[in-house]
Interface confidence: medium
């Protein structure tokens, strides 16, 4: 039960990539507004997105304080123009979100190949260490900062002239692979957290090929 003409939010969903974290819900409001609260299991509730007509709320600033905590959010519904009004139980109508643990659940963003360098029959491929919105001491932390050795990268590489792919893995941001001299290769990388049960892999990076601008070549 709730206040006349207000409906509870539903389909509360966390959308999170590289810790940029937004809570979304339905329905689009008709004569009502929403306020969101977020808390850890042991913490106090903090209100965000006060009396909004949006159906999303950016909670990044809260979850980045400790990305390993488990968070719960709730969305309150109020009649538009009468936000003091409460439900029959003496409080506004609200709905809880699923629990969300950023470290375990945030989606890994699409990685980018920063550079590749060929020296003879070896190619060094470097993945850009993407910055997240986790911030400490005026430092935007990179994915590697946050995940450490939990994060690996998988490299897919193939000769430009064929479709047969090879793979390599690294728990740093660099690969050193053997290639055939005189052949051009294409590369794509994927971020992976093997220990996860969900959202384990990112989408593949854009493909970069030798003979294009991105690389650097020193044939010896």
């Amino acid at each position: 039960s709730g206040t006349t003409n207000t409906v509870a939010a539903y389909n509360l969903t966390w959308k999170s990539t590289n810790f940029k974290t937004i809570l979304e819900w339905e329905p689009k409001p008709v004569n009502q507004v929403y306020t969101v609260q977020i808390s850890t299991k042991s913490g106090d509730w903090k209100s965000k997105c006060f009396y909004t007509t949006d159906t999303e709320c950016d909670l990044t600033d809260e979850i980045v304080k400790d990305v390993k905590q488990t968070y719960l959010a709730r969305v309150f519904s109020y009649p538009a123009g009468n936000v003091e009004s409460t439900g029959s139980a003496g409080e506004p109508l609200y709905e809880n979100s699923p629990e969300f643990t950023p470290y375990l659940e945030t989606n890994l963003g699409q990685p980018t190949i920063q550079s590749f360098e060929q020296v003879g029959t070896k190619v060094n491929v470097t993945v850009e260490d993407e910055r997240t919105l986790v911030r400490r001491n005026n430092t935007f932390l990179s994915l590697r900062d946050v995940f450490g050795k939990d994060l690996i990268y998988t490299l897919y590489y193939w000769k430009s002239s064929s479709s047969g792919k090879k793979t390599a893995k690294t728990n740093t941001n660099e690969f050193l692979i053997d290639v055939d001299k005189g052949e051009n290769y294409c590369f794509s990388v994927q971020a992976v957290i093997p220990s996860r049960t969900v959202n384990r892999k990112s989408t593949d990076s854009p493909v970069e090929c030798m003979g294009q601008e991105k690389g650097e070549f020193r044939e010896i």
């Epitope: 400790d66 430092t139 935007f140 990179s142 900062d145 740093t172």
Partner: antibody, heavy 121, light 106 residues
Framework: EVQLVESGGGLVQPGGSLRLSCAAS????????MSWVRQAPGKGLEWVGF??????????EYAASVKGRFTISRDNSKNSLYLQMNTLRTEDTAVYYC????????????WGQGTLVTVSS | DIQMTQSPSSLSASVGDRVTITCQAS??????LNWYQHKPGKGPKLLIY???TLQTGVPSRFSGSGSGTDFTFTVSNLQPEDIATYYC????????FGQGTKLEIK
Amino acid sequence: EVQLVESGGGLVQPGGSLRLSCAASGFTFTEYHMSWVRQAPGKGLEWVGFIRNRANAYTTEYAASVKGRFTISRDNSKNSLYLQMNTLRTEDTAVYYCARLTMVVAEFDYWGQGTLVTVSS
Amino acid sequence: DIQMTQSPSSLSASVGDRVTITCQASQDINKYLNWYQHKPGKGPKLLIYYTSTLQTGVPSRFSGSGSGTDFTFTVSNLQPEDIATYYCLQYDNLLTFGQGTKLEIK
């Protein structure tokens, strides 16, 4: 295996200079923030400063007690961290440790064995 | 710089006791406070981060609480291996250690 080995400590007169080195191995040096921490005889730990990683352009921060006198730098091609100490004071006497810093939770996760700097006339 | 005042500077307790150490910041540091354990000849070890989150592998007898400027570290069932010096460390604005608390067993 991660290893940090400091060197360069010794006896120096007040007003003098000294350069400490820290050789790092066992990890991709450019990906990590690095820090210096010191401990004066019979006293507690004191953070000296840190240098950020490649993703943060190797920028530096210092404790107020050493700002303007000490400079942290790194040579990534040599996997080495440095602490240039100028205008040394007697209160700078301490064992100086280099440590790898995981910034997300401010964890010094690996430490060197330390090198003693004595400032005395 | 933010100053951290840690007390007591030393304390002696018996095995099984509950011991408490406090740390006070000179300004609001949110919950960006860690507790380290330092044993002679070893590098300091992170026990608790972000005021109350136990680092992986740390026994649950260690706990922390607080926010803003006042923080508390507790060992609930003191063990012989807990003999060490304990430090708080703020990381809201740069880094500052507390002066340390030397914990001894009676």
